[in-house]
Amino acid sequence: VVSHFNDCPDSHTQFCFHGTCRFLVQEDKPACVCHSGYVGARCEHADLLA
């Protein structure tokens, strides 16, 4: 399944702790693109290997 990404709705602007929220249109779900040095589904963990 090819997902299309857009900015998340305003309801989810704070969803990603250390990253950018992207909206998976077809799945109706949020996803996070983490800033450098962070990992996790919501970019909530510092990457100790970075």
């Epitope: 998340c8 305003d10 309801s11 949020p30």
Partner: antibody, heavy 116, light 107 residues
Framework: VQLQESGPGLVKPSQSLSLTCTVT?????????WNWIRQFPGNKLEWMGY???????SYNPSLKSRISITRDTSKNQFFLQLNSVTTEDTATYYC??????????WGQGTLVTVSA | DIQMTQTTSSLSASLGDRLTISCRAS??????LNWYQQKPDGTVKLLIY???RLHSGVPSRFSGSGSGTDYSLTISNLEQEDIATYFC?????????FGGGTKLEIK
């Protein structure tokens, strides 16, 4: 996925309204948000709140002091409780599966009348 | 809360017609606009999500468009089974809110 609402069709003013949504074909702990929506006489729709697959809840601020949504994962059911009802709570109540922006699948609805 | 307005509460059309139902939001909802169909028996189905995307199983005669605060649903070749009430819903901001509905009737 199929959703089916059930519960009393008549509730007295000041009492609590309790409804059950039974979900088949999908586990409510797997994903998605499990919502309650109501439709007043005259067609106006109102989102009431949801319980997510993880168990977290979100409620419409207009109802926050009166509403509770819970679940029984062993029965794959979720529940609506609305306290201190008045005749203004007379509506058709729907349960629906949603994501973060839309309601993809709805139950058939159940009419609840609040009357003495 | 974001107010959703469907200015036309009822619409009369003939089978085979092309018709458009409008919906306006009280503020920019960034294309997070969905359309639902409610049949006379109360059954509700999602038709279109994110302004213009067809939900699975929905006939291609349904289409959606719009941006910012103004959105529309178009039925290109009206069929008997399309007789229903149509609701818009914004999904950008909690609490999610609905338009008042547009009831479609046959001339």
């Amino acid at each position: 996925v199929q959703l089916q609402e059930s519960g009393p069709g008549l509730v007295k003013p000041s009492q609590s309204l309790s409804l059950t949504c039974t979900v088949t074909g999908y586990s409510i702990t797997s994903d998605y948000a499990w919502n309650w929506i109501r439709q007043f006489p005259g067609n106006k729709l109102e989102w009431m709140g949801y319980i997510s697959y993880s168990g977290s809840t979100s409620y419409n601020p207009s109802l926050k002091s009166r509403i509770s949504i819970t679940r029984d994962t062993s029965k794959n059911q979720f529940f609506l409780q609305l306290n201190s009802v008045t005749t203004e709570d007379t509506a058709t109540y729907y349960c629906a599966r949603g994501g973060i922006t839309r309601f993809a699948y709805w139950g058939q609805g159940t009419l609840v009348t609040v009357s003495a | 809360d974001i107010q959703m307005t469907q200015t036309t509460s009822s619409l009369s059309a003939s089978l085979g017609d092309r018709l458009t139902i409008s919906c306006r939001a009280s503020q920019d909802i960034r294309n997070y606009l969905n359309w639902y169909q409610q049949k006379p028996d109360g059954t509700v189905k999602l038709l279109i999500y994110y302004t213009s995307r067809l939900h699975s199983g929905v006939p291609s005669r349904f289409s959606g468009s719009g941006s910012g605060t103004d959105y529309s649903l178009t039925i290109s070749n009206l069929e008997q089974e399309d007789i229903a009430t149509y609701f818009c819903q914004q999904g950008n901001t909690l609490p999610w809110t609905f338009g008042g509905g547009t009831k479609l009737e046959i001339k």
